[in-house]
Amino acid sequence: SEVEYRAEVGQNAYLPCFYTPAAPGNLVPVCWGKGACPVFECGNVVLRTDERDVNYWTSRYWLNGDFRKGDVSLTIENVTLADSGIYCCRIQIPGIMNDEKFNLKLVIKPAKVTPAPTRQRDFTAAFPRMLTTRGHGPAETQTLGSLPDINLTQISTLANELRDSRLANDLRDSGATIRIG
């Protein structure tokens, strides 16, 4: 089941997703899509990273966190009711069926009052429960094009109320991550 996050119309929504690169420079491609994670890739891709960059995005979607250290949390700017729905964060670990997929449900509520202009980091998110998954031993190590050699040792995500980016970093540093390598 999806973890639920909430934001009001006109605010920025924040959907957390983290992993830990195996080594400096060894980034894993990540895609974000609107809709539940399919078997492969992301449907309706809104943002994508490769082994070094954000290499595709659509307007209003960006990574405000330290994505080169594995904070691939998605910010959606100035949300509307139409932004409600399920979003997929997919960590594209090389190897057959190694990808880690996270479905996050975004609920947009009408603004109670006319919102004042918000700073880019403003968001309101609710995280009602914790979801934890464990990897079953190391994944097969494969090399894919110019991607690094990686293996999967631990997978976990934490859903907890995030007040600001500093807390997001604290959570990541305390183990709210997918660890690779």
Epitope: P24, R52, D53, S146
Partner: antibody
């Protein structure tokens, strides 16, 4: 200490190709990206692309796609940038620059620059 | 492509001044901005990476700030050796793009 030493100045005719080299020393060549940046006379800086020597992966600025090729020779820790079908507006100083993960792929070391003049 | 705009091409300063050079991105780039200093006939030198991290050996009078779309390089106590061109660069997404540069001159 880290050093990036580039090849000497080149004068080329329009339509020709140029290949600039950048020899790295003082660090593990395969652990860092090598980017190429150019600067036309009196102008700003323009990114051409990068190569990751460890895996050979490249990414080029679309503006130069089809005209630029970046390669490395790991045995000599040397990066190369070839630009083809030269035009007069390719006249510039070409720099290699090391993209470090710890500096978030900003450029902590630069070569001294290679002046490429395109003139008929 | 993400456009980086340095609106001030030239700035007149005096030794001891506090100088702020601004750079605006056409879309959010998080904190993925670097600042470089370039003196005539020399290669650029890295001053600030990831918006606010001072590179090794850079004097502490240089400070970077900002995130999202608006970034500032501040020189708190201008020295004669700081007369140079200053460029911002986004390294959020390729093609990496640079601002047009700001040249510091003496009044």
């Amino acid at each position: 200490q880290v050093q990036l030493v580039q090849s000497g100045a080149e004068v080329k005719k329009p339509g020709a190709s140029v290949k600039v080299s950048c020899k790295a020393s003082g660090y593990t060549f395969t652990d860092y990206y090598m980017d190429w940046v150019r600067q036309a006379p009196g102008q700003g800086l323009e990114w051409l692309g990068y190569i990751y020597p460890n895996k050979g992966g490249t990414s080029y600025n679309q503006k130069f796609k089809g005209r630029v090729t970046m390669t490395t020779d790991k045995s000599t820790s040397t990066a190369y940038m070839e630009l083809r079908s030269l035009r007069s507006d390719d006249t510039a100083v070409y720099y290699c620059a090391r993209g470090g993960y710890y500096s978030y792929y900003s450029y902590d070391y630069w070569g001294q620059g290679t002046t490429v003049t395109v003139s008929s | 492509d993400i456009v980086m705009t340095q609106s001030q091409k030239f700035m007149s300063t005096s030794v001891g001044d506090r100088v702020s050079i601004t750079c605006k991105a056409s879309q959010s780039v998080g904190n993925n901005v670097a600042w470089y200093q370039q003196k005539p006939g020399q290669s650029p030198k890295l001053l600030i990476y990831y918006a606010s991290n001072r590179y090794t050996g850079v004097p502490d009078r240089f400070t970077g700030s900002g995130s999202g779309t608006d970034f500032t390089l501040t020189i708190s106590n201008m020295q004669s050796e700081d007369l140079a061109d200053y460029f911002c660069q986004q390294h959020y997404s390729s093609p990496y793009t640079f601002g047009g540069g700001t040249k510091l001159e003496i009044k």
